[in-house]
Amino acid sequence: PEPPTACREKQYLINSQCCSLCQPGQKLVSDCTEFTETECLPCGESEFLDTWNRETHCHQHKYCDPNLGLRVQQKGTSETDTICTCEEGWHCTSEACESCVLHRSCSPGFGVKQIATGVSDTICEPCPVGFFSNVSSAFEKCHPWTSCETKDLVVQQAGTNKTDVVCGPQDRLRA
């Protein structure tokens, strides 16, 4: 028969014959022959391969370096890489999460729209009219101005995006 020019899924062409790829978690040791199947062996304890492959070396699991603020979110297996995340108060600088930076704080006049996670930074928003934030914080939202009326008081000093209103007693009309 004619030697193949293409092979089925999960196979590869070598020496004019189709050999089975090694399954995820295993590396290639020797190609198949006309008498034997592909020889594969498992990846080591700190290694992985996540696809059907013909790799002769497994990949090393990612190291979550605590000096960079990283910790293990999910331990790697022979078929998956380790997933790193950041320590509390820090977030990844990239999708690959190779290092961490401190969560950003929202300055006075801005409130937290979305609290940071291990993989995303704090999202701040300017405090709209009627709201304020007088602190730099990674958690505080914009607070509504105090309602003087509900306290039977009147506004003595208008609020801003950084300050609350100041309430005071109503002027009494003299009889």
């Epitope: 020496n15 040791v29 020797s30 062996l41 080591g44 304890e45 013909r54 002769t56």
Partner: antibody
């Protein structure tokens, strides 16, 4: 043709050194683990060691071979080597070059090494 | 190093006999065991790999079984061309960095005509 051809055997004095070569052809040398196996006259097979596939293939040896024998390869020349130092009379054997690790799919014809004064 | 203990060292049998050869590993090797046949003046020939997989072109009268430490090669009906020496090969594969890969052959079993 898929084959392994050993060379470099011969008579050597005790304490001497010898380098065996194994020329591989007909298959992708770079993606196959390669082993050395020896057989003393009239005796059984004895595993010497292995070099795994890939450019920086790891090597492993039988405990008796560690420190005296070294396996290496030149992928560009599709050639496997066995460097043997501090040879002893008990190293007299036919040395086979072989393809595979947990099972050997291809053997060379062997080269005879005789250690004698 | 791993040690493979093969028995018997020799056996005499007749054509048509059922022959069994055993091999024991000094530590668990999973299914990393192969069987070879060798005739005088020739290189060994692979018969069985992964403990029980028959190499292509090898007659179906040859079969292998076992895992861990105990393995068996069976020739269901001995043929004239089967008189030879048989070897098992065990392979200890390490997935840790503290131990090393090693392999060993059994001492061999010579099958002779009764």
């Amino acid at each position: 043709e898929v084959q392994l051809v050993e060379s470099g055997g011969g008579l050597v004095q005790p304490g001497g050194s010898l380098r065996l070569s194994c020329a591989a052809s007909g298959f992708d040398f770079s993606s196959n683990a390669m082993s050395w196996v020896r057989q003393a006259p009239g005796k059984g097979l004895e595993w010497v060691g292995i070099i795994y596939a890939g450019s920086s293939g790891s090597t492993y040896y039988a405990s008796w071979a560690k420190g005296r024998f070294t396996i290496s390869k030149d992928t560009s020349k599709t050639t496997l080597y066995l460097q043997m130092n501090s040879l002893r009379a008990e190293d007299t054997a036919t040395y086979f070059c072989a393809r595979g690790a947990t099972y050997i799919t291809l053997w060379g014809q062997g080269t005879l090494v005789t250690v004698s004064s | 190093d791993i040690v493979m203990t093969q028995s018997p060292s020799s056996l005499s049998a007749s054509v048509g006999d059922r022959v069994t050869i055993t091999c024991q590993a000094s530590q668990s090797i999973g299914s990393y065991l192969a069987w070879y046949q060798q005739k005088p003046g020739q290189a060994p020939k692979l018969l069985i790999y992964r403990a029980s997989t028959l190499a292509s072109g090898v007659p179906s009268r040859f079969s292998g079984s076992g895992s861990g430490t105990d393995f068996t090669l069976t020739i269901s009906s001995l043929q004239p061309e089967d008189f030879a020496t048989y070897y098992c090969q065990g392979y200890y594969y390490s997935t840790t960095t503290t131990t090393y890969d090693s392999s060993a052959f059994g001492q061999g079993t010579k099958v002779v005509i009764k």
